[in-house]
């Protein structure tokens, strides 16, 4: 008789990333008997919820259920029915909800409450919805990329070819850019982490890691743009804002009430003699870069070294994986190649921002105008943040790897979050090698 493979003994987990601009659902899968091995968990599905981030439903919380339905249905379809009841579901909300909580704890709680009730309706093992801290977001992103790169493993990796191969076990730093916050996380070289708030200690697979992390709230790409507009409109002589971060010929009317809706613009708020103003793009990279730099306060630093706004940052060390919006924006601009120098990136950005809006619209007809209009700002912001904010140089630029996926799994905090909550990263190295899951009878 022919040998038959035994039914796969696998487990699944679901994590929803409730970001400021959208929500994504990730489904992970791993062999049950290799739970404590490094590198065995992989992503089998990503579903982007069709719509904005959950914080936008604050005035219509009754619609959160319908908003989440499609992706939860997809999870029900992808995961075998026999596994539904033992599949954990976690929802982590990030900076969009942190900002809502700053405005009103009651409103943030109401949104999360409806989210929890909606997710409890599905046949999975719902484990709760919460707003994760910026420190957690940075830490879990760092765990994710190093787990996927096999950096925690002392033995042969489960996959054959690892991108960004380095011959040592030195971990990668993690650079995460969202819509409302940005995180930087890495292991500094023999450096004391001078501010306790930025220090994390991990013991993973028998090794100790002293990790630096910081999350800059309001410095995600969307909130940074709101900050820049609020700053620049202060000095505008009338309701026309000639903006170097938008393409020549671009025009958009902005409501002042929308501008001041976010806590991120509070420091620039002033009484303006108009309710609306019009952005008129002039498309100048250098001027845009200069305007963005004004968002970073570098005049004050109570430590040996700072990033900006008085936040401690040790000297950069090793390679970095830049993911989420760092990757999406640079991918759109075709600037993710390892071979593209920082000088070349700057050159390309100068050309891109100077392109007339009508030309850009024709070249990228399939892209929503709201997104399309902001790539000049976003690309310039990424360069400003990495170079002036985090002190990367033309030389150290080559240590930044713009990463979308690693071995089919998205780079981001969700995998690290699930690994931690399901206790799948042991403090000590597992003693014995478990059986292979491709057992035949």
């Amino acid at each position: 008789t022919q040998n038959k493979a035994l039914p796969e003994n696998v487990k699944y987990g679901i994590v929803l990333d409730a970001g400021s601009s959208h929500t994504s659902l990730y489904i992970y899968k791993w062999p049950a008997e290799k739970e404590n091995d490094t590198g065995v968990v992989h992503q089998v599905e990503e579903c982007r919820v069709k719509g904005p981030g959950i914080s936008k439903f604050v005035q219509k919380v009754n619609e959160i259920g319908i908003y989440l339905t499609d992706c939860m249905e997809r999870a029900r379809e992808v995961i075998p029915r026999s596994q539904h009841q033992e599949t954990p579901v976690y929802l982590g909300a990030t900076a969009g909800m942190r900002l809502l909580r700053m405005e009103s704890e009651e409103l943030a709680d109401r949104v999360l409450d409806v989210v929890e009730r909606s997710l409890s309706n599905y046949p999975f093992d719902f484990q709760g919805a919460r707003i994760i801290t910026g420190q957690e977001e940075g830490a879990y992103g760092w765990i994710t990329i190093n787990y996927l790169l096999g950096k925690f493993s002392q033995k042969t990796r489960w996959f054959s070819i690892v991108p960004y191969e380095t011959n040592n076990q030195e971990t990668f730093g993690a650079l995460d850019l969202g819509g409302a916050s940005t995180q930087v996380t890495f292991v500094p070289q023999n450096q004391t982490i001078e501010s306790p708030d930025n220090a994390l200690q991990f013991r993973l697979y028998g090794k100790d890691y002293n990790v630096y992390t910081h999350s800059f709230l309001c410095y995600g790409k969307d909130q940074a743009l709101w900050q820049k507009l609020a700053k620049d409109i202060q000095v505008a002589s009338n309701e026309i804002l000639r903006d170097p971060c938008f393409h020549p010929g671009y025009k958009k009317v902005v409501n002042v009430s929308d501008l001041y809706k976010t806590p991120c613009t509070k420091r620039f708020e002033m009484t303006l003699p108009f309710q609306q103003f019009e952005i008129q793009g002039i498309g100048n990279y250098q001027q845009c870069h200069q305007s963005i730099l004004e968002l970073f306060n570098t005049s004050y630093c109570p430590y040996s070294q700072c990033a900006f706004n008085g936040i401690f940052l040790p000297p950069l060390q090793g390679d970095f994986g830049a993911f989420s919006a760092f990757y999406f924006v640079m991918k759109f601009l075709n600037l993710t190649s390892e071979k593209v120098s920082q000088e070349k990136v700057t050159e390309m950005m100068k050309k891109f921002c100077a392109q007339p809006w009508e030309e850009i619209k024709t070249s990228y007809a399939g892209v929503k105008e709201k997104y399309l209009s902001e790539y000049c700002f976003s690309g310039t912001y990424i360069l400003s943040l990495l170079l002036q904010g985090y002190h990367f140089t033309a030389d150290s630029w080559e240590h930044i790897h713009f990463i979308g996926k690693i071995q089919g799994s998205d780079a981001g905090w969700t995998l690290g979050y699930m690994l931690n909550l399901t206790n799948m990263i042991p403090a000590e190295q597992p003693l014995s090698t478990p059986l292979s899951h491709s057992t035949y009878v």
Partner: antibody, heavy 120, light 106 residues
Amino acid sequence: EIQVQQSGPELVKPGASVKVSCKASGYSFTDYNMYWVKQSHGKSLEWIGFIDPYNGYTSYNQKFKGKATLTIDKSSSTAFMHLNSLTSEDSAVYYCAIYGYDDAYYFDYWGQGTTLTVSS
Amino acid sequence: QIVLTQSPAIMSASPGEKVTITCSATSSVSYMHWFRQKPGTSPKLWIYSTSNLASGVPARFSGSGSGTSYSLTISRMAAEDAATYYCQQRITYPFTFGSGTKLEIT
């Protein structure tokens, strides 16, 4: 302005196959699922399935598995439905549609419909 | 799959009259959508998430219900409301439509 434009009417012979197209504009094509619906003459609506242009994921109504195949071409922001082994039972109006949230506003846009006639 | 049964299948109403169309589901669903279709045109979203009116829908329309029983109500029938109305659930794959209610004006 969001628009969903379908290909014109089709008259095909039994046993043949047909490919109906649906061109979307006015939004980022990968932002919303494209779903397909069948309406036989004088009858109700039947959900065929959907495709997520973001990653190509498809889901079908069991009844249409093997009959309909959904694909996309991101470069032209177009979705396609291929129907095979056609019989008179497949004669109907086929609609493509998108729905979801734009900001926090719910919408649902349908194409104008493609009439398929299967006849010898 | 969830089967949706609408009643009545056909009905007539006079201008100004109150009209109620019901939709019954074989399993509990947490919300219902309603579509309106006029001859020779595509269906239009009319009410979403049980009770929210789609853009441009007159305020004389309302929706309600929960679990397995939902309804669409027109407080005062108008000539332009003559059409076929379909309920739809988008809770469980495959998404399903009701059998339709043809509303005529008398």
